[in-house]
Interface confidence: medium
């Protein structure tokens, strides 16, 4: 008899296989412990051992810890299944700058596209948006409020991070307002967070807050470990580190075993008064490139590229704090000025943000 | 009938290693975690790891930072565990358990092993 | 890693009046629409002996005045009435995530 016609559903009274009514078929009875991995197994490979929770079996027959979308700009792409991970993406409005494996290690807001430009590819989960001029010979120079506005998202074309080098790529860069990062232990072990993707897909059971054997004596790798979020200062004390929790401010550097956390101004807004480590106020201020060009583009996953205009051409809107006063430029990377000189020569891509340094040259920031 | 057969009491030094063994019996071994979990005398309950006896894979409590190692020997059907770098809050009873595939849960338990930590 | 709080401590009764145990965990221990949350009970000199699975189903060979129920993260084991058995020590466990962890326990004793 066929084998989906068995009779009288034994299964040829073959013990190792037993009849399912719903499928009309003999199927492969998987031995105990192990779990189908489909409704109707028909061999041995069919049968699978059974991981934790958040955990899948991988290609090696390992139980692997799913990567975890905690991060406030990750959305869950597909779920943890028995076999293959949770995967990751930046959430609606954003775009991964950093991938990490099933995951996203930096996000990044889609830039608006400037005034005179025209969204030519809506941003994606994976690319930023493409911009392209609006008409060829049309350059209106901020005519209207509208060409001054500071882009619905709060950012600003954004330049492209330096390279930085395989073994630290994934691990050294956090998304905009991410959770904690843990910095570069004695300057050469470098750690991942303890929710960041792992290379590995297993979550790090040493966040590198400590050495992992006990401190020989003598050692001059032993240090005095302070709490999560203090800092061992100069004096050698046990310093909080300053919190960037309020919502005009992100981290630009991350509290380590030896330094504070820094915050700055997020993306479209510029710091009014300074703080240690931080800006006690941050103002807001409008996008003017209103004269870009495209440049074209080599890298295909890369977003678009902007020259800035011509000399002279540069729209007069900056912004003046409620006070009135000119904003202070506290920082090196805060300045308002921006020389047309440096900024003409200068293509800013726009997939990290701008700095802008003293001398009024954009630098480009890894973050 | 599944049985998991503990080794018996054992006593330690400070800063030494214990290494209890679990012998399986009734059931495919290969094909089931097993679960090693402690209590302190008149204490709670402490999840330690599990091992996966077809294939050697492991998940750790992380408190234990690196000092159990869990191990299995298919061919006799025995779980090992050892904890190294003993201290007297180690003293407690060690229970090895089989963890039911599906819902997660330690159906079989052996019958425990005594270790006392002193100098 | 997840806590579980089991309350009371101690529940003084006598044999046929009701017991109920809370266990509260600190996150919520849903999974693809179960509660991984286990119930054991365990007697002096002996291993705990698994009880409930999945928030709510009694184990083969426990007797029906065993129940459990509760989702997300508050989770009871009712004992309908007690039998001079019963009287023992219950732990709550999950395995929502690893590290697994178990509750306190509370001791059932006779009042």
């Known amino acids: 008899f066929p084998q989906d016609r068995p009779f009288e559903d034994t299964c040829h009274g073959n013990p190792s296989h037993y009849y399912d009514k719903a499928v009309r078929r003999c199927c492969y009875r998987c031995p105990m412990g192990l779990f189908p991995t489909q409704q109707c197994p028909q061999r041995p490979t069919d049968c699978r051992k059974q991981c934790e929770p958040d955990y899948y079996l991988d290609e090696a027959d390992r139980c692997t810890a799913c990567v975890t979308c905690s991060r406030d700009d990750l959305v869950e792409k597909t779920p943890c299944a028995w076999n293959s991970s949770r995967v990751c993406e930046c959430r609606p409005g954003m775009f991964c700058s950093t991938s990490a494996v099933n995951s996203c290690a930096r996000c990044f807001f889609h830039s608006v596209c400037p005034a005179g430009m025209i969204v030519k590819f809506p941003g994606t989960a994976q690319k930023n948006t493409v911009c392209e001029p609006a008409s060829p010979g049309v350059s209106p120079a901020c005519a209207s409020p509208e060409n001054c506005k500071e882009p619905s998202s709060g950012t600003i074309p954004q330049a492209k991070p330096t390279p930085v080098s395989p073994a630290t790529s994934s691990a050294s860069t956090m998304p905009v307002r991410g959770g904690t990062r843990l910095a570069q232990e004695a300057a050469s072990k470098l750690t991942r967070a303890p929710d960041s993707p792992s290379s590995v897909g297993r979550p790090s059971s040493d966040p590198g807050l400590s050495p992992t054997q006990p401190c020989p004596e003598g050692s001059g790798d032993c240090r005095k470990q302070c709490e999560p979020d203090y800092y061992l200062d100069e004096a050698g004390r046990c310093t909080a580190c300053v919190s960037c929790s309020r919502d005009d401010l992100v981290e630009k550097t991350p509290c380590a075993w030896n330094s504070s956390r820094t915050c700055e101004c997020r993306p479209g807004m510029i710091c009014a008064t300074s703080a240690t480590n931080s800006c006690a106020r941050c103002v807001p201020y409008p996008i003017c490139a209103a004269e870009t060009v495209t440049k074209p583009q080599d890298m295909a996953e890369k977003d678009t590229t902007f020259e800035a205009p011509p000399l002279g051409t540069q729209p007069d809107c900056n912004p003046t704090p409620e006070n009135g006063e000119a904003p202070a430029s506290t920082s090196p990377t805060q300045s308002l000025l921006v020389d047309s000189q440096a900024s003409k020569t200068l293509p800013i891509p726009t997939s990290a943000p701008v700095a802008l340094s003293s001398t009024g040259k954009p630098v480009l920031d890894a973050g | 009938e599944v049985q998991l057969v503990q080794s018996g009491a054992e006593v330690k030094k400070p800063g030494s290693s214990v290494k209890v063994s679990c012998k399986a019996s009734?059931?495919?071994?290969?094909?089931?975690?097993m679960n090693w979990v402690r209590q302190a005398p008149g204490q709670g309950l402490e999840w330690m790891g599990q091992i996966y006896p077809g294939d050697g894979d492991t998940n750790y409590n992380g408190k234990f930072q690196g000092r159990v190692t869990l191990t299995a020997d298919k061919s006799t059907s025995t779980a090992y565990m050892e904890l190294s770098s003993l201290r007297s809050e180690d003293t407690a009873v060690y229970f090895c358990?089989?963890?039911?595939?599906?819902?997660?849960?330690?159906?079989?338990w052996g019958q425990g092993t005594l270790v006392t930590v002193s100098s | 890693e997840i806590v579980l709080t089991q309350s009371p401590a101690t529940l003084s009764l006598s044999p046929g009046e009701r017991a109920t145990l809370s266990c509260r965990a600190s996150e919520s221990l849903e999974y693809y629409g179960t509660s991984l949350m286990l119930w054991y009970q365990q007697k002096p000199g002996q291993p705990p002996k698994l009880l409930i699975y999945?928030?709510?189903n009694v184990e083969t060979g426990i007797p029906a005045r065993f129940s459990g129920s509760g989702s997300g993260t508050d989770f009871t084991l009712t004992i309908s009435s007690l039998e001079p058995e019963d009287f023992a020590v219950y732990f709550c466990q999950q395995r929502r995530k690893v590290p697994s962890t178990f509750g306190g326990g509370t001791k059932v004793e006779i009042k």
């Open positions: 358990a089989r963890r039911i595939n599906g819902n997660f849960a330690m159906d079989y």
């Open positions: 009734g059931y495919a071994f290969s094909s089931y975690w």
């Open positions: 999945s928030a709510s």
